[in-house]
Amino acid sequence: APSCPQNVNISGGTFTLSHGWAPGSLLTYSCPQGLYPSPASRLCKSSGQWQTPGATRSLSKAVCKPVRCPAPVSFENGIYTPRLGSYPVGGNVSFECEDGFILRGSPVRQCRPNGMWDGETAVCDNGAGHCPNPGISLGAVRTGFRFGHGDKVRYRCSSNLVLTGSSERECQGNGVWSGTEPICRQPYSYDFPEDVAPALGTSFSHMLGATNPTQKTKESLGRKIQIQRSGHLNLYLLLDCSQSVSENDFLIFKESASLMVDRIFSFEINVSVAIITFASEPKVLMSVLNDNSRDMTEVISSLENANYKDHENGTGTNTYAALNSVYLMMNNQMRLLGMETMAWQEIRHAIILLTDGKSNMGGSPKTAVDHIREILNINQKRNDYLDIYAIGVGKLDVDWRELNELGSKKDGERHAFILQDTKALHQVFEHMLDVSKLTDTICGVGNMSANASDQERTPWHVTIKPKSQETCRGALISDQWVLTAAHCFRDGNDHSLWRVNVGDPKSQWGKEFLIEKAVISPGFDVFAKKNQGILEFYGDDIALLKLAQKVKMSTHARPICLPCTMEANLALRRPQGSTCRDHENELLNKQSVPAHFVALNGSKLNINLKMGVEWTSCAEVVSQEKTMFPNLTDVREVVTDQFLCSGTQEDESPCKGESGGAVFLERRFRFFQVGLVSWGLYNPCLGSADKNSRKRAPRSKVPPPRDFHINLFRMQPWLRQHLGDVLNFLPL
């Protein structure tokens, strides 16, 4: 077969080929940020000629053109400046309202390099309607000027702009407009991952319902959905495998889907995952009717087995058939469970479509969506039972109109996105399911995204201050209790001056809480073994503080999971009959267990907890500490089995002021506290300039550094005695 000519350079940009110069290969242009390629792509035809998708005239030279943002077409009850036909990247537009109107949204907006405006639609509103003035997004024209209950407004976009969101919205009884805000965008525009991840994540979190099945009442961010213990989510992942998707991109589709599966299983809900790859025909790799669809490892392995070559005989994009196979799956499940049963009616369904182009065969995908809505009986009351996310990847041939038509329309949410490339998709899936925004007390959730603050990464972490100075750290283990070290409290029982500083999204300094009650282990006595020549002894170094008020859960304040509780059992996705011993075997399951603690400056530092034989050699070093233990004969007199040991090799050592803080591990995107920082042989902060300076111990130091942490598995009786009505403990 003839190959296509190679004179296809783009001035100022680059290009990639999906299958070299052979027929069927897709040539994709890209330009530096702030510019877009025209045309975006070309396809090598069997005749050996390049064809530009959608082009009517002959092949023109490819160029990088400057990105521009759409201008306002009309702005009600106010003025905007400057008035231009379109705006360059970095250009601003400012809005002001006439007297009697209040500006809602962003008074100044800037054109971003992706052709999208930053901020929110500016609206001048006088608050007269049943619903607020829905505004007119930049580049849009609205018809309908009444905002009473039942009134409708319609939108269209000027010139060649594409509408995403709802073209028609209705003012509902609750004073909220139906659907989602329409946005007019350039056909070449795309979404930045940092915008998509939170938008997608918020919507998804709503759908998941912030479910913590051990809670009596459940509230999520916005939509108050309750997926009870009996509730169930069916997640359908549809991966485009058509010709225009390169093998490498398909791998990233798979990897992104794996991230999604991994993350979704870390929620405490019952979930079944279907995997469907599609080109000209769909291929079901995992059906929700298969019991394995509830098992994360099975789902991931079926994803891993998805083969790019499965579709090499039919390379079109038949989105209709892919969605129709979801419909058929639903139909079969409905027949199995019975149409009228709660078991069927209470299942929530989420479809994630990953595609790189418009469907070009098999009929309109919208028809399949209509069938799906029909079988699930989606109406205003049951709107929460279906979410369709349409994600286009690679700006080239993605059809905004089609994606928008497929994506769900829900107030304050977005379900249709276009990303620049598969790398951006991977980024989104890495960060989208940020459970840390949930408002209930789901435990052990930290925000793992790259741009999260230290406190968002470890939201259980608190600082304890006796007077003005910080002295110890601790961990929230519920919305009112903090776990810390007993040795922090050496001034008798007057805690009236003490404060606990808890993370707060509204202040970088956190929020201070008074202590209602301090429960210090009666077994703790630092001088208990003084007459044996052990000048300091830290057995039973554990304390609980009850805060004077409950902490409001947020991105910055949330409890860590305590092992041996039902809350931790759910987070570990363990079966119901699990015991405390099972948790210990799962969490402390190696000779050297990687763990973390939080430094004075809030960063997360790494240690390795030594178990078994390695614990013995880790602890042995204490015999070399002659000041604190002048005539020690048996190390176990000092290092009892209440302690975990770390500090060997490359471990960081905690400073004195880090005492009481959690020693924790990560499993399945959740965090579990296995110990608390107690004492050590080396202080890396001693005499340092500030919280950011730590000194490594010299290699020649005698004794070498060692750190000892109270092992929570050994403190169960005491924890149960004081927290029995706060947490749900498992049998020992």
Epitope: E470, V526, C655, S688, A689, K691
Partner: nanobody, 122 residues
Framework: QVQLVESGGGLVQPGGSLRLSCSAS????????MGWFRQAPGKEREFVAS????????EYADSVKGRFTISRDNSKNTLYLQMNSLRAEDTAVYYC???????????????WGQGTQVTVSS
């Protein structure tokens, strides 16, 4: 907060000894880690030694290890620094400090004495 007053400084020949004292007011002395810092002219303040609130553990800067000994008497609310084999480079103003956590971070310390001058010279 603990109020601290140092004493015992003076002029001493190289190889000689001095004993510094730091008297603390406030009944909470026994619950604080105590430490000594020093500052030579034109230099940063540097850590010299510290002792835990129990008196059970001590830490020293490498430059004074084996020559200086820190101790405390909780019944007298007093901290001591015994300095032997003094060298010219030990010349500095010596400050006593109290710290509840035991890290003695310079940015966080709010209990300092006014200092006592030690000069080692022949």
């Amino acid at each position: 907060q603990v109020q601290l007053v140092e004493s015992g400084g003076g002029l001493v020949q190289p190889g000689g000894s001095l004993r510094l004292s730091c008297s603390a007011s406030g009944h909470t002395f026994r619950s604080y880690y105590m430490g000594w810092f020093r500052q030579a002219p034109g230099k940063e303040r540097e850590f010299v030694a510290s002792i835990s609130w129990t008196g059970g553990s001590t830490e020293y800067a490498d430059s004074v290890k084996g020559r200086f000994t820190i101790s405390r008497d909780n019944s007298k609310n007093t901290l001591y620094l015994q300095m032997n084999s003094l060298r010219a480079e030990d010349t500095a103003v010596y400050y006593c400090a109290a710290d509840y956590s035991g890290d003695f971070l310079l940015s966080d310390l709010d209990s300092w004495g006014q200092g006592t001058q030690v000069t080692v010279s022949s």
